[in-house]
Interface confidence: medium
């Protein structure tokens, strides 16, 4: 039978009355238009809602927006449009919410054509009050907060100027002209590219990469012949044009651009691209596009320096620059990533890695599902997950896969069961062990969200008709209860819950449509009375992550250590609570060859854990620039996987000896860098 329809599904007692007492409707006095919602701070309960409506007139478009504020997680809203002088807010800039719990908000206003600059509204008290500030420039991008100091803002102007504020947008200073792209680094550092001749587009590949560590008092040119740059974890990447032709290569720095090394990755041509898929302080996943319009490329994983790369996955689906990839970090379990590959027959298949890109496999077929029409063998197939690509292709997939760091092991996604992703209507599947095993959770497409660190999962059917029913589960999606939250169905547009999945409130957004009017409406449901008591020690059970063979002493070892978690029992109906912290007990594993990647010039033959020298490099000196120094490298072929904590066991030793050889492979050598002050 379908999930949730079994006899053993116990009902949550008196839930209708409990939820009815905790369901709060708010009808917005608005024409429909568009709505955007932002949470201000963590655990503050403050939500800002901006509704905008465009009235197309013959000559111009007249716009009107309203701003609403809630401080009780969306149960009640107050119209605060007067705090921003009833000004029309530009939705393309969104609401710029400050980092952490700074309580800062910046809204960018629409201004009339002749004005000399833009206008912003600033709040530093969680949107209780706003200050209007006229800008000396027209912003091109949303204001960007420094991650270290929320008083420091940067923005690009429509004239390509780089503007900085040191007092939360009160006063602005243009620190550089002809800027293409600017990003905050660590320690209030700003990295940006500049053009010398015509424009960003015309100078692509001839840009300069600059750095300022003092908000524009002094500058250092840290790169030339730049195509683009990116930051990931502790790595700074630049794609640099080769001297001889139109190809470019990735260079990497771990010291804010003072010194660079060429990444051992293939170069790419004009039509190709590099993309940082994921990065942390240990390593990076890099996608390198294939030549031609293939729609796929190769994933490489880096060593701890970001220099040496191992091929991780072939035929990785990534349509075009800035296009679609299904690459997803499963945040509920360490080391797990899901993505799609384009197979030889042009079908799309899902792959998963449990060891940070070391090995990829298909997802195991859910026990309670049959193989669909794409399967050649009806008994052998796997689960294929719908993500960004399916959504872009307009499949009936309302949401991307969902996981939360504090809902350990839980992954929810739309999928189909067969040999490849199917164009058929998908179902919703859940994994409670980080992607090792899967179960069909809900039939047909749904919106879903995780509340109370996994204690509650909420879902709403994706339907063509107005809806008035919400589904919820207190046992990680095994059994479902349905609750009619309103007598009058609404056209559903989205589910909103506080980021971080710690809340017990869910807001259902939609609009009502009658013959003449159409209004935004939200229903906020608080599940606190469903989970009547706080969870106690007896409600939790010990779970070993990545366990595949309990008989094996090394069971659960991933990247050199295993972790035991305390997890809520499925049968326990209780509150983890807002202060819930994931309890985990790590233990170090013995090293094996699996804990090492092959160094540059070495590779692993299939089904072998030993690294062997690449034939074409046998007997050659390996040469590349390490930290900008001239270095000759001899190696026995192994390097510990970034983030791997194993000790003892197998331990191949690595030698590096310095030979004064000319380093020829670094376009960003120190002599091409210079400094100057404002």
């Amino acid at each position: 039978s379908a999930p949730g329809e079994d006899e053993e599904c116990g009902r949550v007692r008196d839930f209708v009355a409990k939820l009815a007492n905790n369901t709060h409707q708010h009808v917005f006095d608005d024409l429909r238009g568009s709505v955007s919602l932002s949470w201000v701070g963590d655990s503050t309960g403050v939500i800002l809602v901006l509704t905008t409506f465009h009235v197309p007139l013959v000559i111009m478009t007249f716009g009107q927006s309203k701003l609403y504020r809630s401080e009780d997680y969306g149960k009640n809203f107050k119209d605060i449009t007067d705090l921003i002088n009833n000004t029309f807010i530009r939705t393309e800039f969104g609401m710029a919410i400050g980092p952490e719990n700074s309580g800062k908000v910046v809204l960018t206003a629409e201004v009339s054509g002749g004005s000399r600059g833009g206008r912003i509204f600033r709040s530093s008290d969680f949107a209780k009050n706003f200050v209007q500030t006229d800008l000396p420039f027209h912003p091109l991008t949303q204001m960007m907060y420094s991650p270290q100091n929320s008083d420091y803002l940067l923005a690009l102007s429509t004239e390509n100027g780089l503007w900085v504020s040191k007092n939360f947008g009160g006063k602005w200073e243009e620190i550089h002209k002809a800027v293409c792209l600017a990003k905050w680094g660590s320690d209030n550092t700003i990295f940006f590219t500049t053009y010398a001749n015509g424009s960003c587009k015309a100078d692509l590949g001839a840009l300069e990469l600059w750095r300022t560590s003092d908000l524009g008092k002094s500058f250092k040119t840290i790169g030339v012949k730049i195509y683009s740059f990116g930051l990931g974890g502790r790595f700074l990447f630049a794609s640099v044009m080769a001297d001889k032709d139109t190809t470019r290569r990735i260079h990497v720095s771990t010291d804010q651009g003072d010194t660079w090394s060429m990444a051992q990755l293939p170069s790419v041509g004009q039509e190709q691209f590099y993309s940082i898929l994921a990065a942390n302080d240990d390593m990076v996943f890099m996608h390198v596009d294939e030549p031609g319009d293939t729609g796929f490329g190769t994933i490489f994983t880096s060593d701890d320096r970001g220099i040496v790369y191992s091929k991780s996955l072939d035929r990785h689906l990534y349509t075009t620059t800035g296009g679609e990839t299904d690459f997803t970090n499963v945040t509920s379990l360490r080391g797990v990533y899901i993505t799609s590959v384009l197979s030889e027959d042009n079908s799309i298949q899902t792959m998963i890695t449990f060891d940070q890109g070391g090995r990829w496999t298909h997802l195991r077929k859910p026990e309670n599902s049959e193989c669909d029409a794409t399967a050649k063998n009806k008994n052998e197939c796997s689960l294929h997950i719908h993500a960004s690509y399916s959504i872009s292709q307009k499949l009936n997939v309302p949401m991307a896969p969902l996981s939360e760091p504090n809902a350990v092991g839980i992954v929810i996604a739309h999928g189909s069961v067969g040999d490849a992703i199917s164009v058929m209507v998908p179902d919703v599947y859940i994994s409670d062990d980080g992607g090792y095993s899967w179960t069909k959770m809900l039939e047909g497409p749904h919106y879903y969200t995780i509340l109370d660190s996994g204690g509650i999962i909420v879902a709403i059917e994706h339907s063509s008709r107005p809806i008035n029913v919400i589904k919820f589960s207190t046992d990680e999606g095994q059994c479902w209860q349905t609750y009619t939250f309103t007598r009058d169905p609404i056209y559903f547009t989205g589910l909103a819950s506080e980021p971080g999945a710690r809340s017990m409130n869910i807001s259902i957004w939609g609009f009502t449509e009658s013959f003449l009017t159409s209004q935004w409406v939200s229903y906020t449901i608080d599940f606190k009375d469903i989970l009547e008591r706080n969870c106690e020690e007896k409600d939790y059970t010990i779970w070993l992550a990545h366990s595949t063979d309990p008989e094996d002493y090394e069971d659960g070892c991933i990247l050199g250590y295993k972790e035991q978690f305390l997890r809520l029992r499925k049968s326990s109906v209780c509150q983890n609570g807002r202060d819930y912290v994931v309890t985990k007990q790590p233990s170090i594993c013995l090293c094996s060859l699996e804990d090492f990647l092959c160094d540059f010039g070495y590779y692993r033959p299939e089904n072998d854990s030993k690294c062997v020298e690449q034939p074409e490099l046998k007997g050659h000196d390996l040469e590349f620039c390490l930290y900008g120094r001239e270095e000759h490298l001899t190696t026995n072929g192994y390097r510990k996987i970034p983030g791997d904590k194993c000790q003892g066991g197998v331990n191949p030793v690595r030698e590096v000896k310095d030979l004064k050889k000319k380093c020829t492979s670094n376009f960003l050598s120190p002599e091409k860098q210079n400094s100057k002050s404002n």
Epitope: K394, L395, V423, H462, S464, R465, P466, Y491, T493
Partner: antibody
Framework: QVQLVQSGAEVKKPGASVKVSCKAS????????MSWVRQAPGQGLEWMGI????????SYAQKFQGRVTMTRDTSTSTVYMELSSLRSEDTAVYYC??????????????????????WGQGTTVTVSS | EIVMTQSPATLSVSPGERATLSCRAS??????LAWYQQKPGQAPRLLIY???TRATGIPARFSGSGSGTEFTLTISSLQSEDFAVYYC?????????FGGGTKVEIK
């Protein structure tokens, strides 16, 4: 107006292949899937498979797997269905049908399964020695 | 695959009378169900989608109901042009499947 125009009738020998075309007009070709359905004389409707015009990905009914190939040409807004290793029981009228299927088009009223809303006039394929 | 069973195979009704056609799915198809009308020598025509929504231009005398495994097509007052074969079709799981059809003939 929205229409699907199919190629003309075909007579084939057993073992041969047939390729039927279906030209779409009056709507954005890449916004809808195309299904192929056949109907043997005096029989009911039988779904053969579906193609996504954007990426060209397909899903075929198990019965036709290995024998059917669906392709599309976005430049001419045409979908093709090729059936190989023909046998006498493949004698039927073959229809192409616009099939929103899994596509969620913009706007709340057009979500969910919408049925095969536009059909071609049908192509009669006769397989006989 | 999901098997769709239609009943009755033939339905004899007088013009002006009500006709009720049934369609049963071997497993739940939610509301992913469509009804088609086909007249001799013509391509099928979409009547109902999403189990109960009338397609564009379909008269109000046609209505669909049901969800899960049991579905009904009702023609409230048969007109002469309604005598035809009616098919149900599910789009819940691949492959799409049709029922065997119900022929509505003049009594």
């Amino acid at each position: 107006q929205v229409q699907l125009v199919q190629s003309g009738a075909e007579v084939k020998k057993p073992g041969a292949s047939v390729k039927v075309s279906c030209k779409a007009s009056g709507y954005t070709f890449t916004k809808y899937y195309m299904s192929w359905v056949r109907q043997a004389p005096g029989q009911g409707l039988e779904w053969m498979g579906i193609i996504n015009p954007i990426g060209g990905s397909t899903s075929y009914a198990q019965k036709f797997q290995g024998r059917v190939t669906m392709t599309r040409d976005t430049s001419t807004s045409t979908v093709y269905m090729e059936l190989s290793s023909l046998r006498s029981e493949d004698t039927a009228v073959y229809y192409c049908a616009r099939d929103p299927s899994g596509i969620a088009l913009a706007g709340p009223a057009s979500r969910g399964y919408q049925g095969m809303d536009v059909w071609g006039q049908g192509t009669t394929v006769t397989v006989s020695s | 695959e999901i098997v769709m069973t239609q009943s009755p195979a033939t339905l004899s009704v007088s013009p002006g009378e009500r006709a009720t056609l049934s369609c049963r799915a071997s497993q739940s198809v939610s509301s992913n169900l469509a009804w088609y009308q086909q007249k001799p020598g013509q391509a099928p025509r979409l009547l109902i989608y999403g189990a109960s929504t009338r397609a564009t231009g379909i008269p109000a005398r046609f209505s669909g109901s049901g969800s899960g495994t049991e579905f009904t097509l009702t023609i409230s007052s048969l007109q002469s042009e309604d005598f035809a074969v009616y098919y149900c079709q599910q789009a819940r799981l691949g492959p799409w499947t049709f029922g065997g059809g119900t022929k509505v003939e003049i009594k």
